[in-house]
Interface confidence: low
């Protein structure tokens, strides 16, 4: 802040301000902690009154240094404390879900166990771990789908795949296929060996 005639008695700069002359005019150049024509007022922005990333500006109100806040997008009010377009303000997450802002008008709900959906409004169909034998549960509409490993099938991956039903057979050179849970076993003739009777017996 700048004021007149700071080299005159009674007009000196206070609080460490420096009196500088430019273009025939004398003025106090204040340090950051003080403002005003003679650096007489504490800088009201030092207390960071503007919240939510608002920017503080020193303003003169009838000769007294005051502040004004320029608020960041999404906030208003003298101290930028009033949210505007905050999608979480309406508490969109139900059943104990936690609302996270993605942008000021877009939110994502972190749902507690047993709930899913945009607003945690859907009972999570996968919460009971319905997919057996290492199957992966995926919520689908109001229900679920199990993605089963290769050896199992069925709605909950509980049905064993009969590998011995494949054509051509898995057991080579006249070997006999025996189905097992999640797998199969070849019983080879005397002439061959290996998991699929693929190697001649030497």
């Amino acid at each position: 802040a700048r004021g007149p005639r700071c080299s005159q008695p009674g007009e000196t700069c206070l609080n460490g301000g420096k009196c500088e002359a430019a273009n025939g005019t004398e003025a106090c150049v204040c340090g950051g902690a003080f403002v005003g024509p003679r650096c007489q007022d504490p800088n009201p922005c030092l207390s960071t009154p503007c919240k939510n990333a608002g920017t503080c500006h020193v303003v003169d109100r009838r000769g007294v240094a005051d502040y004004a806040c320029s608020c960041a997008l999404g906030f208003s009010g003298p101290l930028c404390l009033t949210p505007l377009d905050n999608a979480c303000l309406t508490n969109p997450c139900r059943n104990g879900g936690t609302c996270d802002l993605l942008t000021l008008t877009e939110y994502k709900c972190r749902c507690p166990p047993g709930w899913s959906g945009k607003s945690c409004q859907q009972a999570d169909p996968c919460a009971s771990n319905p997919c057996a034998n290492g199957g992966q549960c995926l919520p689908f509409e109001a229900s679920y789908i199990c993605h089963c490993p290769p050896s199992f099938h069925g709605p909950t991956c509980r049905q064993d795949v009969n590998e011995c039903g494949q054509k051509p057979g898995l057991c080579r050179h006249g070997g006999t296929c025996h189905n097992e849970v999640g797998s199969y076993r070849c019983v080879c003739r005397a002439t061959h060996t290996g998991p699929n009777c693929e190697r001649p017996y030497v």
């Epitope: 960041a72 997008l73 505007l84 377009d85 942008t103 008008t105």
Partner: antibody, heavy 117, light 107 residues
Framework: EVQLVESGGGLVQPGGSLRLSCAAS????????MSWVRQAPGKRLEWVAY????????SYSDAIRGRFTISRDNAKNTLYLQMNSLRAEDTAIYYC??????????WGQGTLVTVSS | DIQMTQSTSSLSASLGDRVTVSCSAS??????LNWYQQKPDGTLKLLIY???NLHSGVPSRFSGSGSGTDYSLTISNLEPEDIATYYC?????????FGGGTKLEIK
Amino acid sequence: EVQLVESGGGLVQPGGSLRLSCAASGFTFSSYTMSWVRQAPGKRLEWVAYIDYGGDFTSYSDAIRGRFTISRDNAKNTLYLQMNSLRAEDTAIYYCSRRRYDAMDYWGQGTLVTVSS
Amino acid sequence: DIQMTQSTSSLSASLGDRVTVSCSASQAISNYLNWYQQKPDGTLKLLIYYTTNLHSGVPSRFSGSGSGTDYSLTISNLEPEDIATYYCQQYSKFPWTFGGGTKLEIK
């Protein structure tokens, strides 16, 4: 289908006034914040003013603050921009836009305001 | 105010090319960046919001990326209807500000 149609532009003398309107249809007008954006001939887009859902909060660019007023009538699905003390540098195409996802997701076709003596 | 700079004011490319339009902010804007397309007739459309999110109805050949102060819009396979001017816009702080635009032309 979302539609925004501006009107009210024209030729006005420096110091004069104009009132722009933007008629909205195809969506629930009162559920969206709105903005005016302008573009001077051959120049970049310049945000002008913003208004929230009920008209309680407005914000303006420094270039027009104190001269322009943004308002809305939710019953008529219409956005307004009252422009006073117009200057030559206010000559531009004025667009109204709907705000969603913190972006202006739909725009009108624009209305030309020419300030000249 | 936050200044948005699009260093390339015009860009010439061939159909089928991969084109990148860049935009930089005078300070970090935390991914609060949108991209718009303005056709020669003045029609304006939102392409991408919040740096990477494709607006509904926008072809998937458009994509956005960036962080901090530097952002870009990529068109992976240039088509004739992509001839337009592209603007970035920040909404980190009022006043919202736009880049100067990059005009895309066909070679």
